[in-house]
């Protein structure tokens, strides 16, 4: 793939740049929110202010809601707690790759990627490795750019997330998200 800028430019919701900008803001806001709930402060994340436009607000609220639901999944939390942060690069790349290894893309998996990144960041904060925070965000955004960007464009941009999780059965979808991430972590544990 040659990513030298053939994709549409400008401010449209499906332009590469807009999807990445929104993705970065959503990821940053999601991580800040989860860190805040833990009572942790992450000044390293205060780079660009998260915009307050209605669309991004809705997306952020949707992500928060899913994050809260995933937080209550005890099996998933046990798996994440067992992640060895001595080799975060290896863990991140293996788990992220495994989540999408079957070539099937859906918003649940995109959210699972964000959630996993946020948990790695929180582990980094707890273990006093603040320089790892930007790095994990960088890995996540690179993964988004390289593996998920085309698919998000095909969904009409980030607003597709709202329709995916905006149904009465969103809790069911969240259970599926937890399952995807748990399965990937299980595979990683076996390989590790």
């Amino acid at each position: 793939m040659d990513g030298s800028g053939e994709q549409p430019r400008g401010g449209g919701p499906t332009s590469s740049e807009q999807i990445m900008k929104t993705g970065a803001l959503l990821l940053q806001g999601f991580i800040q929110d989860r860190a805040g709930r833990m009572g942790g402060e992450a000044p390293e994340l205060a780079l660009d202010p998260v915009p307050q436009d209605a669309s991004t607000k809705k997306l952020s609220e949707c992500l928060k809601r899913i994050g809260d639901e995933l937080d209550s999944n005890m099996e998933l939390q046990r798996m994440i707690a067992a992640v060895d942060t001595d080799s975060p690069r290896e863990v991140f790349f293996r788990v992220a790759a495994d989540m999408f290894s079957d070539g099937n893309f859906n918003w649940g998996r995109v959210v699972a990627l964000f959630y996993f990144a946020s948990k790695l960041v929180l582990k980094a904060l707890c273990t006093k490795v603040p320089e790892l925070i930007r790095t994990i965000m960088g890995w996540t955004l690179d993964f988004l750019r390289e593996r998920l960007l085309g698919w998000i464009q095909d969904q009409g941009g980030w607003d597709g997330l709202l329709s995916y999780f905006g149904t009465p059965t969103w809790q069911t979808v969240t259970i599926f998200v937890a399952g995807v991430l748990t399965a990937s972590l299980t595979i990683w544990k076996k390989m590790g």
Epitope: M1, G138, D142, R145
Partner: antibody
Framework: EVQLVESGGGLVQPGGSLRLSCAAS????????IHWVRQAPGKGLEWVAS????????YYADSVKGRFTISADTSKNTAYLQMNSLRAEDTAVYYC??????????????????WGQGTLVTVSS | DIQMTQSPSSLSASVGDRVTITCRAS??????VAWYQQKPGKAPKLLIY???SLYSGVPSRFSGSRSGTDFTLTISSLQPEDFATYYC?????????FGQGTKVEIK
């Protein structure tokens, strides 16, 4: 110890070809972006190409697209730059460098933290 | 392509001086900017990444800051080994682009 060592430079006639190698040690290239950056005599730095073997993706500057090909052999932990249809303006010292994250559209960048010593490519008749 | 306009192109300073080099991006590059030092015949060395993060092993007299699309490299107290050429670089949008360089010479 992390190290990058370039080789393969030399004198070549316009229209000719060269293959540069960048042998890495102390880290696994599959986890990083490897970039080629060049510097013409007395001039500034110009990004040429990059590769991520993890994502199987390659990127090129417009000035070399269609003429240069970047590749990597993870078993040898080595990246390559195949340069065809060389022109006088390709004369430069070619460096390889690694990047942990932040190729493009990423709001954070680790920067090019390790560089090779460079190899000189001279295109002249 | 994003232009990284670096200024000044050269400057003369004395040991102990405070030196400031600026780089202006032609459009938003978020914080995806790095600064490098290069000495004649040598490869560039990373000083600052993500606009303001000091790379490990780099002396604390070097610092980076960002204000919108303006980026600044500051050397708080110039040392003899700091006389070199400095480059900014953005990696937010393809293609990656460098500033034209600032040569810091002895006054």
């Amino acid at each position: 110890e992390v190290q990058l060592v370039e080789s393969g430079g030399g004198l070549v006639q316009p229209g000719g070809s060269l293959r540069l190698s960048c042998a890495a040690s102390g880290f696994n290239i599959s986890s990083y972006y490897i970039h080629w950056v060049r510097q013409a005599p007395g001039k500034g730095l110009e990004w040429v190409a990059s590769i991520s073997s993890y994502y199987s993706s390659t990127y090129y500057a417009d000035s070399v697209k269609g003429r240069f090909t970047i590749s990597a052999d993870t078993s040898k932990n080595t990246a390559y730059l195949q340069m065809n249809s060389l022109r006088a303006e390709d004369t430069a010292v070619y460096y390889c460098a690694r990047v942990s994250y932040g190729h493009a559209y990423v709001g954070y960048s680790s920067g090019m933290d390790y560089w090779g010593q460079g190899t000189l490519v001279t295109v002249s008749s | 392509d994003i232009q990284m306009t670096q200024s000044p192109s050269s400057l003369s300073a004395s040991v102990g001086d405070r030196v400031t080099i600026t780089c202006r991006a032609s459009q938003s590059v978020s914080s995806a900017v790095a600064w490098y030092q290069q000495k004649p015949g040598k490869a560039p060395k990373l000083l600052i990444y993500s606009a303001s993060s000091l790379y490990s092993g780099v002396p604390s007299r070097f610092s980076g800051s960002r204000s919108g699309t303006d980026f600044t490299l500051t050397i708080s107290s110039l040392q003899p080994e700091d006389f070199a050429t400095y480059y900014c670089q953005q990696s937010y949008v393809s293609p990656i682009t460098f500033g034209q360089g600032t040569k810091v010479e002895i006054k």
